[in-house]
Amino acid sequence: YDFTNCDFEKIKAAYLSTISKDLITYMSGTKSTEFNNTVSCSNRPHCLTEIQSLTFNPTAGCASLAKEMFAMKTKAALAIWCPGYSETQINATQAMKKRRAAKVTTNKCLEQVSQLQGLWRRFNRPLLKQQ
């Protein structure tokens, strides 16, 4: 999916008002210095591509993020403010219902959510030069 035509300001507002808090809740009890940010993004569409991938694609050691509150809210924001995104999710949603992985917070998941926090922060500061 190409995120170029999303309403970035409305997605940013949703992140600031609610998604960010859910990410913090998920990470509660974890030191902010515990994980190094290894995933980066260069512009807003690229950031959303990486955010979608890390949030919804199961990875080795972390198969369960899609059911978390921050993930549900991310999906809603993309469906509402990214033209045509919802139709790409019809089959994906049905597949996810079949999988229905249990919600388990592993260290790998915590690391992944830490990466997500970094991607979202980068999404909110699109004019900063890449380090």
Epitope: N5, D7, K10, A13, A14, S17, T18, M72, K73, K75, A76, A77, A79, I80, W81, P83, G84, S86, E87, Q89, I90, T93
Partner: antibody, heavy 120, light 107 residues
Framework: QVQLVQSGAEVKKPGASVKVSCKAS????????MHWVRQAPGQGLEWMGT????????DYNQNFKGRVTMTTDTSTSTAYMELRSLRSDDTAVYYC?????????????WGQGTLVTVSS | EIVLTQSPGTLSLSPGERATLSCRAS??????VHWYQQKPGQAPRLLIY???QSISGIPDRFSGSGSGTDFTLTISRLEPEDFAVYYC?????????FGQGTKVEIK
């Protein structure tokens, strides 16, 4: 089963405000956005806007910007649509309709409609 | 804003005949089109979603097709209860919009 029950018909004077309610039952309220659509007598359907409880935010059709406010009360699973500075051409049936925001993504259930008549 | 244009405005047919309703979008919207039926004094009822997906409880004489800018709702054999107004809607991008409707009336 899924039900959306709207408040009763209203008669208002030009310049007044109206607040229509839509009580939902039979599903998880926060899994769906609530959309509002109106239909003037003998006319087609016009999308007014939506409130997304999951994100606690709204998005409105520019045609109504500044005149409409959509809210929800998640404790009672009720959505509200307030339209201000009413004009005679706001006379219409106002519908609420739910739409999944993390699945389905379509207006699959509608309220029965609320007739709002604006007349001096 | 995406404009949906439905044609014809009115379709006069007899029970048992086939009805073909068209909906054209002002720009490509992939398959983000849904079809509703509305009878006098009633709320719209969803018939088809995402261009061709069927809804449980809707008779299989209703079918949809199309993608991009051109979409079609087909009623294979009109039953007396099918005479109504039909609307297409796009949810590709905000603001969501509806076509002006096609009235299917008894000839």
């Amino acid at each position: 089963q899924v039900q959306l029950v709207q408040s009763g018909a209203e008669v208002k004077k030009p310049g007044a405000s109206v607040k229509v309610s839509c009580k939902a039952s039979g599903y998880i309220f926060t899994d769906y956005a609530m959309h509002w659509v109106r239909q003037a007598p003998g006319q087609g359907l016009e999308w007014m806007g939506t409130f997304i409880p999951l994100l606690d935010t709204s998005d409105y059709n520019q045609n109504f910007k500044g005149r409409v406010t959509m809210t929800t009360d998640t404790s009672t699973s009720t959505a509200y649509m307030e339209l201000r500075s009413l004009r005679s051409d706001d006379t219409a049936v106002y519908y609420c309709a739910r739409m999944g925001v993390t699945h389905s993504y379509v207006m699959d259930a509608w309220g029965q409609g609320t007739l709002v008549t604006v007349s001096s | 804003e995406i404009v949906l244009t439905q044609s014809p405005g009115t379709l006069s047919l007899s029970p048992g005949e086939r009805a073909t309703l068209s909906c054209r979008a002002s720009q490509p919207i992939s398959i983000s089109v849904h079809w509703y039926q509305q009878k006098p004094g009633q709320a719209p009822r969803l018939l088809i979603y995402f261009a061709s997906q069927s809804i449980s409880g809707i008779p299989d004489r209703f079918s949809g097709s199309g993608s991009g800018t051109d979409f079609t709702l087909t009623i294979s054999r009109l039953e007396p209860e099918d005479f109504a107004v039909y609307y297409c809607q796009q949810t590709f991008s905000l603001p969501y919009t509806f076509g002006q409707g096609t009235k299917v009336e008894i000839k």
